[in-house]
């Protein structure tokens, strides 16, 4: 798997998952955010050969096709699999909030 | 939507759904398909600015980065979203085979 | 029941050359078609690497094996073969088949690896 585990221990040139830390108020210009200061949201990148952790038939058709005619501008892109949530606190005039917000960390990647 | 309907008729350089017709024979060499000669698989490109049909929070946060941060080289990628079937014809020895290809046709794409 | 058998692997000196051979055995590969055909090498740490692929009537090779390898296929027998030429330290690696079948959609199956080694 495309994951956090291999990708992170490895040189790996092709589609992987990469660390990518964003301070809330340096990155983003977020200062309602009051924990945590940043996080790691990490991304997807590296080209897609063929059989790379293809998603659906079209993927592997397009590596295939990409392979075999290296000319070509198409070819799959490597993007999040699996991510997970982020629990935040900030605050609503003094009244402190917790929320957990879905999709924020990337956790692995695919071939789409 | 970034849909066939849409994308076919405009010249947008964002993220779209671009047409790619296949040659089953000259582009995969393919000689078992027998039916039909080839078809459009499409594909999906273009660059992905911040909320352009942003796929999940983390798309959105890491379009936003990207925008605030330009030297940044991490950013969504425009992918598929919608993806119909392809039927086709083969034969096994003399006996013909129909067969349905799921997820073969892409219809419109996403930032992801 | 469906296999993919390996063989031709071991030994060599820099220079030197192997051949290698895999069969698909097993009534899938009768009864549905085969669209590709593929040799994958991988070395520790690494993901498999596509060496060379081979359709019908098209091919292609990695870079770095280009003019050394050629990829071969006996459809009769559903066998495929990489010849391998001067062949250099750097292509030590478990050399993996790969048949990809049409059923229910693009289907991939992995042979168990055959170790090649170059070395003097």
């Known amino acids: 798997a495309l994951d956090t585990n291999y990708c992170f221990r490895n040189l790996e040139e092709n589609c992987c998952v990469r660390p990518l830390y964003i301070d809330f108020r340096q990155d983003l210009g977020w200062k309602w955010v009051h924990e945590p200061k940043g996080y790691y949201a990490n991304f997807c990148s590296g080209p897609c050969p063929y059989l790379r952790s293809a998603d659906t038939t079209h993927s592997t058709v397009l590596g295939l096709y990409n392979t075999l005619n290296p000319e070509a501008s198409a070819s799959p892109c490597c993007v999040p699999q699996d991510l997970e949530p982020l629990t935040i606190l900030y605050y609503v005039g003094r009244t402190p909030k917790v929320e957990q917000l879905s999709n924020m960390v990337v956790k692995s990647c695919k071939c789409s | 939507a970034l849909d066939t309907n849409y994308c076919f008729r405009n010249l947008e350089e964002n993220c779209c759904v671009r047409p790619l017709y296949i040659d089953f024979r000259q582009d995969l060499g393919w000689k078992w398909v027998h039916e039909p000669k080839g078809y459009y698989a499409n594909f999906c490109s273009g660059p992905c600015p911040y909320l352009r049909s942003a796929d999940t929070t983390h798309s959105t946060v890491l379009g936003l980065y990207n925008t605030l941060n330009p030297e940044a080289s991490a950013s969504p990628c425009c992918v598929p979203q919608d993806l119909e079937p392809l039927t086709i014809l083969y034969y096994v020895g003399r006996t013909p085979k129909v067969e349905q290809l799921s997820n073969m046709v892409v219809k419109s794409c996403k930032c992801s | 029941q469906l296999q993919l058998v390996e063989s031709g692997g071991g030994l060599v000196q820099p220079g030197g050359s192997l051949r290698l051979s895999c069969t698909a055995s097993?009534?899938?590969?009768?009864?549905?078609?085969?669209?590709?055909m593929a040799w994958f090498r991988q070395t520790p740490g690494k993901q498999r690497e596509l060496v060379a692929l081979?359709?019908?009537?098209?091919?292609n090779y990695a870079d770095s094996v280009k003019g050394r390898f050629t990829i071969s296929r006996d459809n009769a027998k559903n066998t495929v073969y990489l010849q391998m030429n001067m062949l250099q330290p750097e292509d030590t690696a478990v050399y993996v088949c790969?048949?990809?079948?049409?059923?229910?959609?693009?289907?991939?199956?992995w042979g168990q690896g055959t170790q090649v080694t170059v070395s003097s």
């Open positions: 081979t359709t019908d009537v098209k091919t």
């Open positions: 097993g009534s899938t590969f009768e009864i549905y078609p085969i669209y590709a």
């Open positions: 790969n048949v990809g079948v049409v059923r229910g959609g693009l289907q991939n199956y």
